[in-house]
């Protein structure tokens, strides 16, 4: 009785289980009662990354520098090229088909996590006691100046965008 299902790394065709082609190879002809599956290696610049019955290998991805992309890892017959973004840019998607500049954190916000080639800057609001007066992709929220340690007093309160202003202690005490 012909099989209705096949083992792993096999496929069903013409009521018969044939071996899939291994990664890095494409299908040339299905197996028969008398012959094995015929596979051929992918050519240079092409790949197949799974056990397969594909009749064409896939072209390696091109990391286009005009889109801010660069090669992180060259492709092989079994793997695609891995692209990443040039410095100062990050991928717009998981497949990294184009790049955009890293976001800057506005005044009042600091960098929680610096961007990488594949992820954007993560900003966080500066909590009480911290401030950021610049738009930056690198700067964290900075603590307000401690006037007391300088033997000064707070003359102007700090905000999430400004530091405190310290001044000399008032000598005319009641």
């Amino acid at each position: 009785e012909p099989p209705t299902a096949c083992r792993e790394k096999q496929y069903l065709i013409n009521s018969q289980c044939c071996s899939l082609c291994q990664p890095g190879q494409k299908l040339v002809s299905d197996c028969t009662e008398f012959t094995e599956t015929e596979c051929l290696p992918c050519s240079e610049s092409e790949f197949l990354d799974t056990w397969n019955r594909e009749t064409r290998c896939h072209q390696h991805k091109y990391c286009d520098p005009n889109l801010g992309l660069q090669v992180q890892q060259k492709g092989t017959s079994e793997t695609d090229t891995i692209c990443t973004c040039e410095e100062g840019l990050h991928c717009t998607s998981e497949s990294c088909e184009s790049c955009v500049p890293h976001r800057s954190c506005l005044p009042g916000f600091g960098v929680k996590q610096i961007a990488t080639g594949v992820s954007d800057t993560i900003c966080e609001p500066c909590p009480v006691g911290f401030f950021s007066n610049v738009s930056s992709a690198f700067e964290k929220c900075r603590p307000w100046t401690s006037c007391e340690t300088k033997d000064l007093v707070v003359q102007q309160a700090g905000t999430n965008k400004t530091d405190v202003v310290c001044g000399p202690q008032d000598r005319q005490r009641a």
Epitope: V28, P41, S43, E44, S45, E46, Y62, D64, P65, K74
Partner: antibody, heavy 118, light 106 residues
Framework: QVQLVQSGAEVKKPGASVKVSCTAS????????VHWVKQAPGQGLEWMGR????????KYAPKFQGKATMTADTSTSTVYMELSSLRSEDTAVYYC???????????WGQGTLVTVSS | DIQMTQSPSSLSASVGDRVTITCSAS?????MLWFQQKPGKAPKLLIY???NLASGVPSRFSGSGSGTDFTLTISSLQPEDFATYYC?????????FGGGTKVEIK
């Protein structure tokens, strides 16, 4: 400008060696495999071998094993092909060329003529 | 090594003619590349993966075939097409070229 630039023509005596260079400009040579192709006067193209500039991994056609040595210097984006024990039949134009991507379709150097003559 | 046999080695044709060049591999290969070379110049990639045109290559060029037999066709020969054409396989080391086909003006 995106290109491969090869070193100039060389005239060598039999038994000598020659080192031909191929320098990438406008692209990262590490992103490609670099092939060397021989073309003797009036003859066709002959594949000599290829190098992966990133790690120096090389493959040679049997005919050129021991005759040609391919090396790479990624700091200068340059690959080299040295021919040893030169004979008159090594007289040819030598081309470097890259693997292709759908987007660049491979780059070729302008060719370097090596003449072996006593 | 895989031997690539190209035929004819040369041909004479007129502008407007349909030209067919064949390349036969001694064993099956995945795909074929085709290059065009003009005198004193480096070769230029015309076709990759047997049938795909490289950027900027006119649509009068086409490629076909599989296994051991591959064909380059120029549907209507133009003056700038007079050159030498080479096939190359990059499936098995050592990669090998065909002997070339010189297309001359009749």
């Amino acid at each position: 400008q995106v290109q491969l630039v090869q070193s100039g023509a060389e005239v060598k005596k039999p038994g000598a060696s020659v080192k031909v260079s191929c320098t990438a400009s406008g692209f990262n040579i590490k992103d490609y495999y670099v092939h060397w192709v021989k073309q003797a006067p009036g003859q066709g193209l002959e594949w000599m071998g290829r190098i992966d500039p990133e790690d120096g991994d090389s493959k040679y056609a049997p005919k050129f094993q021991g005759k040609a040595t391919m090396t790479a210097d990624t700091s200068t984006s340059t690959v080299y092909m040295e021919l040893s024990s030169l004979r008159s039949e090594d007289t040819a134009v030598y081309y470097c060329t890259t693997s292709y991507y759908v987007g660049t379709y491979g780059y070729w150097g302008q060719g370097t003529l090596v003449t072996v003559s006593s | 090594d895989i031997q690539m046999t190209q035929s004819p080695s040369s041909l004479s044709a007129s502008v407007g003619d349909r030209v067919t060049i064949t390349c036969s591999a001694s064993s099956s290969v995945s795909y074929m590349l085709w290059f065009q070379q003009k005198p004193g110049k480096a070769p230029k990639l015309l076709i990759y993966s047997t049938s795909n045109l490289a950027s900027g290559v006119p649509s009068r060029f086409s490629g076909s075939g599989s296994g051991t037999d591959f064909t380059l066709t120029i549907s209507s020969l133009q003056p700038e097409d007079f050159a030498t054409y080479y096939c190359q396989q990059r499936t098995f080391y050592p990669y090998t070229f065909g002997g070339g086909t010189k297309v001359e003006i009749k």
